[in-house]
């Protein structure tokens, strides 16, 4: 999906009001020095691409994020504020239902959510190169 035509300001507002708080809840008890951000993004569409990938695509050691509250709210925000996003996700959602696993918060998931917080931070404040 190409995130270029999303309403970035509406997504940002949704992030600040709810999604960010759910991410903080998920990370509660984790030291702020624990994880270094290794995934980066260069502009808002790129940030949303990376956010979608880390939120909804199972990775080795962390298969369960898509069922978390922050993920469901992310999905809702993208569906509302990114034209045509919902349609592209129908097949992906059906495939996800088939491989639903029980929720387990692993250290790998905590690291992945820390990366997500970093991506959202850059989505909110992309530091574009100065001419």
């Amino acid at each position: 999906y190409d995130f270029t035509n999303c309403d970035f300001e509406k997504i940002k507002a949704a992030y600040l009001s709810t999604i960010s708080k759910d991410l903080i809840t998920y990370m509660s008890g984790t030291k702020s020095t624990e994880f270094n951000n290794t995934v980066s993004c260069s502009n808002r569409p790129h940030c949303l691409t990376e956010i979608q990938s880390l939120t909804f695509n199972p990775t080795a050691g962390c298969a369960s994020l898509a069922k978390e509250m922050f993920a469901m709210k992310t999905k809702a925000a993208l569906a509302i504020w990114c034209p045509g996003y919902s349609e592209t996700q129908i097949n992906a959602t059906q495939a996800m239902k088939k491989r639903r696993k029980r929720k387990v918060t692993t250290n790998k998931c905590l690291e992945q959510v820390s990366q997500l917080q970093g991506l959202w931070r850059r989505f909110n404040r992309p530091l574009l190169k100065q001419q």
């Epitope: 300001e9 940002k12 507002a13 992030y15 600040l16 009001s17 960010s20 903080i24 702020s32 020095t33 624990e34 994880f35 270094n36 951000n37 980066s40 917080q117 970093g118 959202w120 931070r121 850059r122 989505f123 909110n124 404040r125 530091l127 574009l128 190169k129 100065q130």
Partner: antibody, heavy 119, light 107 residues
């Protein structure tokens, strides 16, 4: 806990340069932007610029472009602001600040470094 | 650059009063506005981000509102520790700029 410890007060002559340090602790230094802001005596807050400590990318206010250099040393978790060609109107308190978890504000500030420029 | 204008520049009020400070942006900044409180000789402290979200540890008597170009910070019942200078700042795009400040004094 998160702390930004700035270097001590400086007195400089017009035309000289100054380098102010801001040592970060209590968080992953490279994950958050560091901003620099100044405040002249009895005046408001003025944004100077920002650095991404991970990449070294910077963005400066047009007013300071060419006179200010922001750097970061990842090994010591320290950010630096160097201001050259000093003039009397640069006399101010200089603050470093860390961007918040959400990237939508500054949540922690240094205690400030007082710069006096006088002949 | 986006200009931020605060009003009033100073304000006298009493403990228990309800006060509102306004901030106007020279162009649409959506909800990308922050409010800080600063006391003499100290660094500013974050009160509100995203125009209406209260920062951790900030008393509920503070509230922010507005979007686009018009914003306000309201203190519902002034406490002695609230007498300070308040600044708005846009967080829309680099370069960031601050408002001109509002000094809140005891009447």
């Amino acid at each position: 806990q998160v702390q930004l410890q700035q270097s001590g007060a400086e007195v400089k002559k017009p035309g000289a340069s100054v380098k102010v340090s801001c040592k970060a602790s209590g968080y992953a230094f490279t994950n958050y932007l560091i901003e620099w802001v100044r405040q002249a005596p009895g005046q408001g807050l003025e944004w100077i610029g920002v650095i991404n400590p991970e990449s070294g990318d910077t963005y400066y206010s047009e007013k300071f472009q060419g006179r200010v250099t922001l750097t970061a040393d990842k090994s010591t978790s320290t950010a630096y602001m160097e201001l050259s060609s000093l003039r009397s109107e640069d006399s101010a308190v200089y603050f470093c600040a860390k961007e918040s978890l959400t990237g939508s504000s500054y949540d922690y500030w240094g205690q400030g470094t007082t710069l006096t420029v006088s002949s | 650059d986006i200009q931020m204008t605060q009003s009033p520049s100073s304000l006298s009020a009493s403990v228990g009063d309800r006060v509102t400070i306004t901030c106007r942006a020279s162009e649409n900044i959506y909800s990308n506005l922050v409010w800080y409180q600063q006391k003499p000789g100290k660094a500013p402290q974050l009160l509100v981000y995203g125009a209406r979200n209260l920062a951790d540890g900030v008393p509920s008597r503070f509230s922010g509102s507005g979007s686009g170009t018009q914003f306000s910070l309201t203190i519902s019942s002034l406490q002695p520790e609230d007498f300070a200078t308040y600044y708005c700042q846009h967080f829309y795009e680099t370069p960031l700029t601050f408002g001109t400040g509002t000094k809140l004094e005891i009447k």
